[in-house]
């Protein structure tokens, strides 16, 4: 294991659980996670004495790291001590070193809610010349409270003299306020009201008011999948609003369909994104037949950040069909990845490019997570193409070799799927793929090289491929004809397969 | 059918006021995001304020102070409130109706209201 | 603020000709680039919107086309009553700005 510094706790009781007659009271310091062994813990105990003892370190199973206890036991008039625990551990550093300050004891209390509430903008999105901003701590047992206000991230020299505290009932309130120039607020900083309370830190953050022109909304209407549309016959569409500022107003999204009928009832999904913006989700279930038929969908998204309403519709694409070829490949075992393999499928010339891609072992389809699909690409020609890349392990291949690659398509007969499979070890030298309803034992060779399998297309030839009759000098088995694929510039590939 | 009627307009002096009205009809005004376009003579148009279904308002950076736009669903109006007028207002002003679904322009326009400013 | 410039300010076809009209925006727009036709005396009425979709009661001799920044207004075969001003409008949702619509474009008889 690499070197680890400690993190390191401070272990204390409830203050309610020690007596009040106690003459002497034990505190404690936890490091752990560190590693390599040792860690120096020593203690300030101020005015009074105390023994110390350190507890021989312990394994953390998981980790091979360590962790030790050190106790303090004091006497005297401990309650309004602060005790200090100091840990040290060369082997991070010669110099590091970890200070916890406290008490005896932990007292019950009930923290603060820490609330940034800003001057507001006028309608047209201006802002005053100065703007205030006011930090709400309220709700807390009485008790000392530091308010450091932090322009983003560095403390700000402010006047705390204002801040002013009030008790109801057996709860306190305090409010600070920062006033700002309009340039500085702007200026697009980030404004943190933090308060320390009973060894704890508290906050809250504001920027200005959300642009009143929300550049950066976008709006998206799917287009519902193959695989929902032809094999689970439950198709949905989705309307996805994004980058939109959080406000009091919520997004109205509305459906309907060109033709006037009624739609389905749609869920909705909203959700905060991690830069600050909501994500807005509408899910409409659409009737296969429908979708099929040529029905248009519209998702109408208005929000009272938005200075016009929005507008997406979706139908079912037209042009041009045409079906998908599909390509399954094993790539070679790589040197340090015995246990592992990756497959591959190439699914190419395929209009218009909604398509659906699984991978299916043991007659069970994969979860969609096990594999990484590209979106659809243009190809030279007219029609489109994906990879999708599957890891399997060798418990898999050993279980079963065979995975299926399998795609559908609006245009794939009969059913809407194309499928081929792939072996990791197709017991052949070279290993690649063969296609799922290939015999046995094909083999290919252009010109010179013999007994290179290769992905045959099943029983129908590929287009430009022509049909010859079988070699008797073929290992194969004599009623499989010869399939000759006419290629420009390069010896042709001859492979056998059903003609 | 769908009509806007735009009225208030005429002759006032620099530094005065107008308030301008647009009485829609024919459709439902509270389902319609709402902008007023001014055109000055011989000029080109040019967008001046938009007031959305929740009846939030936006202006055109020059306009913002001195324009303020409103709407009265109940009563099928809305206005325009110009304040501090100067020569250069002197334009035919427009009341128009965005397109239900939004995003997609002006569906409908009423004949406008000629503001002159002029002393 | 997406700043919309319209080219060319001034047009002279004949009846019959095909007059296409450039629009080119200062950012991309993502939806609601609209076309309208002016005459004399009138307000503007609405032909294309949403870059491409005919209006309706349009004639099929008007097209639109473009995406991202650069716009185009085609007629196809000018008609007589096609002599007016066409103005571009971009109607972006999440945008306002001084210059929604292009400075204009006055088809003139040659």
């Known amino acids: 294991a690499s070197t680890q510094s400690p993190s390191v706790f401070p272990l204390t009781r409830c203050c309610k659980n020690i007596p009040s007659n106690a003459t002497s009271v034990t505190l404690g310091c936890l490091a752990t996670g560190y590693f390599p062994e040792p860690v120096m813990v020593t203690w300030d105990t101020g005015s009074l004495n105390g023994t110390t003892m350190t507890l021989p370190a312990t394994t953390l199973t998981l980790s091979g790291h360590y962790a030790t206890i050190s106790l303090l036991t004091v006497s005297g008039a401990w309650a309004k001590q602060m005790f200090t625990c100091r840990v040290a551990h060369t082997p991070s550093s010669t110099d590091w070193v970890d200070n916890k300050t406290f008490s005896v004891c932990s007292r019950d209390f009930t923290p603060p809610t820490v609330k940034i509430l800003q001057s507001s903008c006028d309608g047209g999105g201006h802002f005053p010349p100065t703007i205030q901003l006011l930090c709400l701590v309220s709700g807390y047992t009485p008790g000392t409270i530091n308010i450091t206000w932090l322009e983003d991230g560095q403390v700000m020299d402010v006047d705390l003299s204002t801040a002013s505290t009030t008790q109801e009932g057996e709860l306190a309130s305090t409010q600070s306020e920062l006033t700002l120039s309009q340039k500085h607020w702007l200026s697009d900083r980030t404004y943190t009201c933090q308060v320390t309370y009973q060894g704890h830190t508290f906050e809250d953050s504001t920027k200005k008011c959300a642009d009143s022109n929300p550049r950066g909304v976008s709006a998206y209407l799917s287009r519902p999948s193959p695989f929902d549309l032809f094999i689970r016959k439950s198709p949905t569409i989705t309307c996805l609003v994004v980058d939109l500022a959080p406000s009091k107003g919520t997004v109205n999204l509305t459906w309907s369909r060109a033709s006037g009928k009624p739609v389905n009832h749609s869920t909705r999904k909203e959700e905060k994104q991690r830069n600050g913006t909501l994500t807005v989700t509408s899910t409409l279930p659409v009737g296969t037949r429908d979708w099929i038929e040529g029905e248009t969908y519209q998702c109408r998204v208005t929000h009272p950040h938005l200075p016009r309403a929005l507008m997406r519709s979706t139908t079912k694409t037209s042009g041009p069909r045409a079906a998908p070829e599909v390509y399954a490949f094993a790539t070679p075992e790589w040197p340090g990845s015995r246990d592992k393999r990756t497959l591959a499928c190439l699914i190419q010339n395929f209009m218009p490019e909604d398509i659906s891609v699984q991978w299916l072992h043991n007659e069970v389809q994969l979860p969609d997570a096990r594999h990484s699909t590209t979106q659809p690409r243009k190809t030279k020609g007219s029609g489109f193409f994906v990879f999708s890349r599957l890891e399997v392990t060798r418990a898999e291949w050993e279980q079963k070799d065979e995975f299926i690659c399998r795609a559908v398509h609006e245009a794939a007969s009969p059913s809407q799927t194309v499928q081929r499979a792939v072996s990791v070890n197709p017991g052949l030298a070279g290993g690649s793929a063969q296609s799922q309803r290939a015999p046995d034992r094909v083999l290919c060779h252009s010109g010179q090289q013999q007994g290179l399998p290769r992905a045959a297309g099943g029983s129908v030839p590929h287009p430009r491929c022509h049909c010859g009759a079988g070699r008797a000098d073929w290992p194969g088995p004599p009623e499989l004809d010869v399939c000759v694929e006419e290629a420009e510039g390069e010896a042709p590939w001859t492979w056998t397969g059903l003609c | 059918q769908v009509q806007l009627v735009e009225s208030g307009g005429g002759l006032v002096q620099p530094g005065g006021s107008l308030r301008l009205s647009c009485a829609a009809s024919g459709f439902t005004l509270s389902n319609h995001d709402m902008t007023w376009v001014r055109q000055a003579p011989g000029k080109g148009l040019e967008y001046v304020s938009i007031?959305?279904?929740?009846?939030?308002?936006w202006y055109a950076n020059w306009a913002s102070g001195r324009f303020t736009i409103s709407r009265d669903n109940s009563k099928n109006t809305v206005y325009l409130q110009i304040d501090s007028l100067r020569a250069e207002d002197t334009a035919t002003y427009y009341c128009a109706r965005e397109t239900h679904h939004g995003s997609s322009g002006i569906d409908h326009w009423g004949q406008g209201t000629l503001v002159t400013v002029s002393s | 603020d997406i700043q919309m410039t319209q080219s060319p300010s001034s047009v002279s076809a004949s009846v019959g000709d095909r007059v296409t009209i450039t629009c080119r925006a200062s950012q991309s727009i993502y939806s609601g680039l609209a076309w309208y036709q002016q005459k004399p005396g009138q307000p503007p009425k609405l032909l294309i919107y949403d870059h491409s979709t005919l209006a309706s009661g349009v004639p099929s001799r008007f097209s639109g086309s473009g995406s991202g920044t650069e716009y185009a207004l085609t007629i196809s075969s000018l008609q007589p009553e096609d002599f007016a001003t066409y103005y571009c409008q971009h109607a972006d949702y999440a945008h306002h700005s001084d210059n929604v619509f292009g400075g204009g474009t006055k088809v003139e008889i040659k």
């Open positions: 007031i959305n279904t929740y009846g939030n308002h």
